[in-house]
C-alpha cells in the first residue's frame, strides 16, 4: 500500500481552511466527491459530499463546510469556515465510485485549530461573516453510507489547504441554489 502522507495546518479559531483537492479530470469530473474526517481507531467519517452526479462550480454547504467541484479544472475546493478548536483532526478528500471503494486524494490534511485572535472578519462591505447567511433550499445531495478504506494501492494527485486572508470578502447571501445536505454518522 502507498504510504499515506499528511500536511499540517495550524490555524486560529474563526479562520477559514481552504483546501484544493485535484483529480484526474476526464475520469472523475462528474463523480460524487466527499470530505471526510479520520479519527483515531475509527473508519473515516463523511462530513459533506457533492451531489450525484457532481455539478460544476455548484456550492454545497453542510454547516460550516462548503464544497465546490470545478469540473473544468479537475479540482474540488473544500472550505471550513469559522474554525473551532474541536475541528482539529485529520481530514481527506475522496471520490465515490460505487460499487468500488472510494478513491482517496492525497495528501491528508492535519488540521490544528488553536485559540487566539485571528483578526477582524473583514472590513469590506460583505465580510466573511456573511458566509453563514444562506437561504434554506431543498436537500438534493445524499452522501453514501459506506466509508473509505484506510489504504490505497495507487497514489492519486495531491490536495493542499490554506487559510483565507482575514479581510477577504465572501458573500453568499445572494446565492439561492446552494445545496444543503444532511451529515451521516
Amino acid at each position: 500500500a502507498t504510504k499515506l502522507t499528511e500536511e499540517k495546518y495550524e490555524l486560529k479559531e474563526g479562520q477559514t481552511l481552504d483546501v484544493k483537492c485535484d483529480y484526474t479530470l476526464e475520469k472523475f469530473a462528474s463523480s460524487q466527491k466527499a470530505w471526510q474526517i479520520i479519527r483515531d481507531g475509527e473508519m473515516p467519517k463523511t462530513l459533506a459530499c457533492t451531489e450525484r452526479p457532481s455539478k460544476n462550480s455548484h456550492p454545497v454547504q453542510v454547516g460550516r463546510i462548503i464544497l465546490e467541484d470545478y469540473h473544468d479544472h479537475g479540482l474540488l475546493r473544500v472550505r471550513m469556515v469559522n474554525l473551532q478548536v474541536e475541528d482539529s483532526g485529520l481530514y481527506q478528500c475522496v471520490i465515490y465510485q460505487p460499487p468500488k471503494e472510494p478513491h482517496m486524494l492525497f495528501d491528508r490534511i492535519r488540521l490544528v485549530v488553536t485559540k487566539g485572535f485571528s483578526g477582524t472578519p473583514g472590513s469590506n462591505e460583505n465580510s466573511t461573516q456573511n458566509v453563514y447567511k444562506i437561504p434554506p433550499t431543498t436537500t438534493k445531495a445524499l452522501c453514501p453510507l459506506y466509508t473509505s478504506p484506510r489504504t490505497v494501492t495507487q497514489a492519486p494527485p495531491k490536495s493542499t489547504a490554506d487559510v483565507s486572508t482575514p479581510d477577504s470578502e465572501i458573500n453568499l447571501t445572494n446565492v439561492t441554489d446552494i445545496i444543503r445536505v444532511p451529515v451521516f454518522n
Epitope: 479544472h73 479540482l75 495531491k158 493542499t160 477577504s168 470578502e169 458573500n171
Partner: antibody, heavy 118, light 108 residues
Framework: EVQLVESGGGLVQPGGSLRLSCAAS????????MSWVRQAPGKGLEWVAN????????YYVDSVKGRFTISRDNAKNSLYLQMNSLRAEDTAVYYC???????????WGQGTMVTVSS | DIQMTQSPSTLSASVGDRVTITCRAS??????LAWYQQKPGKAPKLLIY???SLESGVPSRFSGSGSGTEFTLTISSLQPDDFATYYC??????????FGGGTKVEIK
C-alpha cells in the same frame, strides 16, 4: 483567440481615483476566477486582487485593502478595479489575468500604466 | 501569507548553457507552483504549472521540478529567445497569491 485587454490607466494625483477595465474575449469569462497583478517600474510582480466567477468572493493584498475594489460584469465579459485614495507606491503597470485554479495565471492582458504623482 | 524566495536574482549565461533557477516557499505549497517568463515591456507568460507540467506551446527545453517548499526551473539549453526575467508564483489556495522576486537571465 483568448484575449484580455486592459484600459483606464493614466496619470492621477495622490489621493485621487481611477477605474481600470479589462475586456475578455475568446473564452467563457463567467467560468473563471480573475485577478489583477501589478508591476512597479523596474520591480517584480505583485498580485493585487482576485474575484470568484460569480463575484461572491473577493480577495486583496494587504496594501490595497479598503482602497481598491475588484468587480466584474459577466454579461459584458468585463473585469474592473476601482482604485481610490491612490498613493505614489501604487504607480505600476496593472495586468488583468485569467485565474485557473489548476494552472495559475494562464492568460494575461498587455497591461495598463497607472502613474500616481503630483 | 506564504513568502516566495527566488535565487539567484541575476544569472549570466551563454547560449547553449544549462540554466537552473530555484524558488523556496516559506511553508509547504505541495505542487501548486507556476513559473512565468517576462520580457521587457511585455506581459508575463505562463511556462510551467503544478511545479512540473509544461504549458501548451512552451518548448520542451523548459522543465520544472520540486514539491513542498523547494522548486527548480531548468532550461536545458539556453536559446537567444530565453534571455528574460523568470518568476515563480504559489497558488496553493484561491488567495492570496505570492510571487518570487524574479531572476533576470542575461547574456554573459
Amino acid at each position: 483567440e483568448v484575449q484580455l485587454v486592459e484600459s483606464g490607466g493614466g496619470l492621477v494625483q495622490p489621493g485621487g481615483s481611477l477605474r481600470l477595465s479589462c475586456a475578455a474575449s475568446g473564452f467563457t469569462f463567467s467560468s473563471y476566477w480573475m485577478s489583477w497583478v501589478r508591476q512597479a517600474p523596474g520591480k517584480g510582480l505583485e498580485w493585487v486582487a482576485n474575484i470568484k466567477q460569480d463575484g461572491s468572493e473577493k480577495y486583496y493584498v494587504d496594501s490595497v485593502k479598503g482602497r481598491f475594489t475588484i468587480s466584474r460584469d459577466n454579461a459584458k465579459n468585463s473585469l474592473y478595479l476601482q482604485m481610490n485614495s491612490l498613493r505614489a507606491e501604487d504607480t505600476a503597470v496593472y495586468y488583468c489575468a485569467r485565474d485557473a485554479p489548476q494552472l495559475g495565471l494562464d492568460v494575461w492582458g498587455q497591461g495598463t500604466m497607472v502613474t500616481v504623482s503630483s | 501569507d506564504i513568502q516566495m524566495t527566488q535565487s539567484p536574482s541575476t544569472l549570466s549565461a551563454s547560449v547553449g548553457d544549462r540554466v537552473t533557477i530555484t524558488c523556496r516557499a516559506s511553508q509547504s505549497i505541495s505542487s501548486w507552483l507556476a513559473w512565468y517568463q517576462q520580457k521587457p515591456g511585455k506581459a508575463p507568460k505562463l511556462l510551467i504549472y503544478k511545479a512540473s507540467s509544461l504549458e501548451s506551446g512552451v518548448p520542451s527545453r523548459f522543465s520544472g521540478s520540486g514539491s513542498g517548499t523547494e522548486f527548480t526551473l531548468t532550461i536545458s539549453s539556453l536559446q537567444p529567445d530565453d534571455f528574460a526575467t523568470y518568476y515563480c508564483q504559489q497558488y496553493k489556495s484561491f488567495s492570496p497569491f505570492t510571487f518570487g522576486g524574479g531572476t533576470k537571465v542575461e547574456i554573459k
